[in-house]
Amino acid sequence: FKVATPYSLYVCPEGQNVTLTCRLLGPVDKGHDVTFYKTWYRSSRGEVQTCSERRPIRNLTFQDLHLHHGGHQAANTSHDLAQRHGLESASDHHGNFSITMRNLTLLDSGLYCCLVVEIRHHHSEHRVHGAMELQVQTGKDAPSNCVVYPSSSQESENITA
């Protein structure tokens, strides 16, 4: 399986909400002995490998933000901890999973990584990740809504989170 990032860059005004998205692409084994662990963390663009370093998102670690389920089941973080920090991660039945960040500040700018781990006994631990950048802007040059830049081309889209 692979992870796709529909958008590689999100440019948002301060105070806005944004939803960062990743998509799990098949083939996805839906056997009873296979489960998927999905989570989010901040990182930096390493010289060797992007997303190798794991930093918290608003003081929440990737352990606090994970989703766990088999195949393409829906799931979301329900505990109050994430919501108290203005965060919520979720996934749907189609392999999409996301993290929503509310009331953005300049400190939220940086590189964000989604991680998927396939858990299967007696097999290698299969890990894949996706990376995207969030730029939070303030002042007269800031957009009125979030602008997202697709990973495949340089065309941009305006979105209202």
């Epitope: 352990q63 606090d64 994970h66 505990h79 901890l81 781990v117 858990i119 290698s124 631990e125 890990r127």
Partner: antibody, heavy 118, light 107 residues
Framework: QVQLVESGGGLVKPGGSLRLSCAAS????????MSWIRQAPGKGLEWVSW????????YYADSVKGRFTISRDNAKNSLYLQMNSLRAEDTAVYYC???????????WGRGTLVTVSS | EIVLTQSPATLSLSPGERATLSCRAS??????LAWYQQKPGQAPRLLIY???NRATGIPARFSGSGSGTDFTLTISSLEPEDFAVYYC?????????FGQGTKVEIK
């Protein structure tokens, strides 16, 4: 930040049983995947068993499969290891540790000593 | 299962010296290798994850390198509190396995 404290160790005769507990303080234990790891006196570390946050799936080392059972009670913030048919070679300090997929054992308890001897 | 072999078994050095510890895997573990430090009577502490990344709060004098089957933990300048036993551990395959440990002792 979660803190882990093991209990339930002690002296038991070969063939006997023991139940270890790992109590977690702090939040959110119910989100964490956990393992038991043991260390025989003066020896190295050996992974014993793993359990997901929801209780399934569960994995065991071949050396304990069929004799040990891992379980958890998220409402009580507790992890357990039921050890049956104990052998002398099971003598060790048993640690519980957080073991998230794609990650490492990043949070450990202080351990509880199990001695199997006649 | 994957066997991890650490060398040397014991390393006798003085404070301020450089320590180089080796871990070799019986088959490739990609970069899914960690290093732990353990002091007498204490639980192990995570130092390095994914072969080369320092865990939170670990001093910069600790560094890890390698991929595949050969890995190295380097302590650039030993501090008194660094004398301990160091274990490597792989999570590429079940079961999780550890090396037998390298003891870093004061010369």
């Amino acid at each position: 930040q979660v803190q882990l404290v093991e209990s339930g160790g002690g002296l038991v005769k070969p063939g006997g049983s023991l139940r270890l507990s790992c109590a977690a303080s702090g939040e959110p234990f119910s989100d964490y995947y956990m393992s038991w790891i043991r260390q025989a006196p003066g020896k190295g570390l050996e992974w014993v068993s793993w359990i997901s946050n929801s209780g399934e799936p569960i994995y065991y080392a071949d050396s304990v499969k069929g004799r040990f059972t891992i379980s958890r009670d998220n409402a009580k913030n507790s992890l357990y290891l039921q050890m049956n048919s104990l052998r002398a070679e099971d003598t060790a300090v048993y640690y519980c540790a957080r073991d998230e997929p794609g990650w490492e054992f990043d949070l450990w308890g202080r351990g509880t000593l199990v001695t199997v001897s006649s | 299962e994957i066997v991890l072999t650490q060398s040397p078994a014991t390393l006798s050095l003085s404070p301020g010296e450089r320590a180089t510890l080796s871990c070799r895997a019986s088959q490739s573990v990609s970069s899914y290798l960690a290093w732990y430090q353990q002091k007498p009577g204490q639980a192990p502490r995570l130092l390095i994850y994914d072969a080369s990344n320092r865990a939170t709060g670990i001093p910069a004098r600790f560094s890890g390198s390698g991929s595949g089957t050969d890995f190295t933990l380097t302590i650039s300048s030993l501090e008194p509190e660094d004398f301990a036993v160091y274990y490597c551990q792989q999570r590429n395959n079940w079961p999780r396995t550890f090396g037998q440990g390298t003891k870093v002792e004061i010369k």
